[in-house]
């Protein structure tokens, strides 16, 4: 159940895909990854106001209970709904290898 | 990849399963659910310090970038890793029906 995509907080303030440029040093990968030297990391950032992109029934419950007691139950959180694969060229004992990671780059976001 | 389960913030402070008691009224379900009158909602609450229960590579990246740019990249968030099903007895036009919801109660938690 993918609920409303209208952000009541204003354009770009709610849960959505963002791109953050990061070097191998930023990621702590310099010692085991050869390429790419820089990664365009796609991640899910933004607020999850009431029923915005609610992933499922659990998210809807969380919204209801957060409204009742914000200090007890946190608001839903903006997280990946799916991922894009990414290939890294890694250093190995014998040279290099290509490794595909399926859970590295967010493709789509929702609130849960 | 399920990283460390040791919480550096102290017992019970990090991402874990909590139970919150909620009535149908609390959940806004009183008009369409007959039973149960009260739900023991299991949900994931708590902090996600560095590499604690990191769900995948994306969570590890998020941790690294949050440390570098806390204003830009949020810390990983405590969300359900899996769910337990729950049966609700619902009101219908003709009487009642039993409906199983697979995404209502959190079973296990991780950080993403």
């Amino acid at each position: 159940a993918r609920n409303g995509d209208h952000c009541p907080l204003g354009p770009g303030r709610c849960c959505r895909l963002h791109t953050v440029r990061a070097s191998l040093e930023d990621l702590g990968w310099a010692d085991w990854v050869l390429s790419p030297r820089e990664v365009q990391v796609t991640m899910c950032i933004g607020a999850c106001p009431s029923q915005f992109r609610a992933a499922n029934m659990h998210a809807q419950i969380k919204t209801s209970l957060h409204r009742l007691k914000p200090d007890t139950v946190p608001a839903p959180c903006c997280v990946p709904a799916s991922y894009n694969p990414m290939v890294l060229i890694q250093k190995t004992d014998t040279g290099v290898s290509l490794q595909t990671y399926d859970d590295l780059l967010a493709k789509d976001c929702h609130c849960i | 990849a399920r990283n460390g389960d040791h919480c550096p913030l102290g017992p019970g402070r990090c991402c874990r399963l909590h139970t919150v008691r909620a009535s149908l009224e609390d959940l806004g379900w009183a008009d369409w659910v007959l039973s149960p009158r009260e739900v023991q909602v299991t949900m994931c609450i708590g902090a996600c310090p560095s590499q604690f229960r990191a769900a995948n590579m994306h969570a590890q990246i998020k941790t690294s970038l949050h440390r570098l740019k806390p204003d830009t990249v949020p810390a990983p968030c405590c969300v359900p890793a899996s769910y337990n099903p729950m049966v609700l007895i619902q009101k219908t036009d003709t009487g009642v029906s039993l409906q199983t919801y697979d995404d209502l109660l959190a079973k296990d938690c991780h950080c993403i």
Partner: antibody, heavy 118, light 107 residues
Framework: QITLKESGPTLVKPTQTLTLTCTFS??????????VSWIRQPPGKGLEWLAH???????RYNPTLKSRLTITKDPSKNQVVLTMTNMDPVDTATYYC??????????WGQGTLVTVSS | DIVLTQSPSFLSASVGDRVTITCKAS??????VAWFQQKPGKSPKALIY???YRYSGVPDRFTGSGSGTEFTLTISSLQPEDFAAYFC?????????FGGGTKLEIK
Amino acid sequence: QITLKESGPTLVKPTQTLTLTCTFSGFSLSTSGMGVSWIRQPPGKGLEWLAHIYWDDDKRYNPTLKSRLTITKDPSKNQVVLTMTNMDPVDTATYYCARSSYGAMDYWGQGTLVTVSS
Amino acid sequence: DIVLTQSPSFLSASVGDRVTITCKASQNVGTNVAWFQQKPGKSPKALIYSASYRYSGVPDRFTGSGSGTEFTLTISSLQPEDFAAYFCQQYNNFPYTFGGGTKLEIK
């Protein structure tokens, strides 16, 4: 129409206990999402939240004052009572009660000025 | 405790002006922020809840925005009755905390 009104002594002596009553109408404190908070404001100063009681009798207190505060409710009388022990001249303030609906304090009483002096 | 830093503390403006008051939280409070107006000798009046929602009866010249740690209250065209003190408040965590207030005065 939602209204709240604070009542209690206007003058208390140091070390005494203050008891304030908030009498409200227009809503039920038995309804999910409802609560009542107490807030105070020393003359010419800002607002300080003191205590909160939820519809389900769950209570919260300001940690700096927790040992001195007690909040209770009587939904049948539409009242919330705050007691504050060991009063001191620095506790001189206008004390407000406010309705909380889903966390947000939407209706406030007119306030009652409490002076602590010997 | 979450500290709300409100700025400016004092603001002089004229009728018809557009003014903005900011409120910064020491940690993420989501959208659980309210704004209040208080006139001398009166109790606070609720203007905005959930960071951006106006209460019924509040003129649409009052606009709230923000989420996380940065929030603003904007009055688009000041009216004589708007000169008062304004407070932000967070209700995401106990203890609930208020900003120090902004006193809006006629220039």
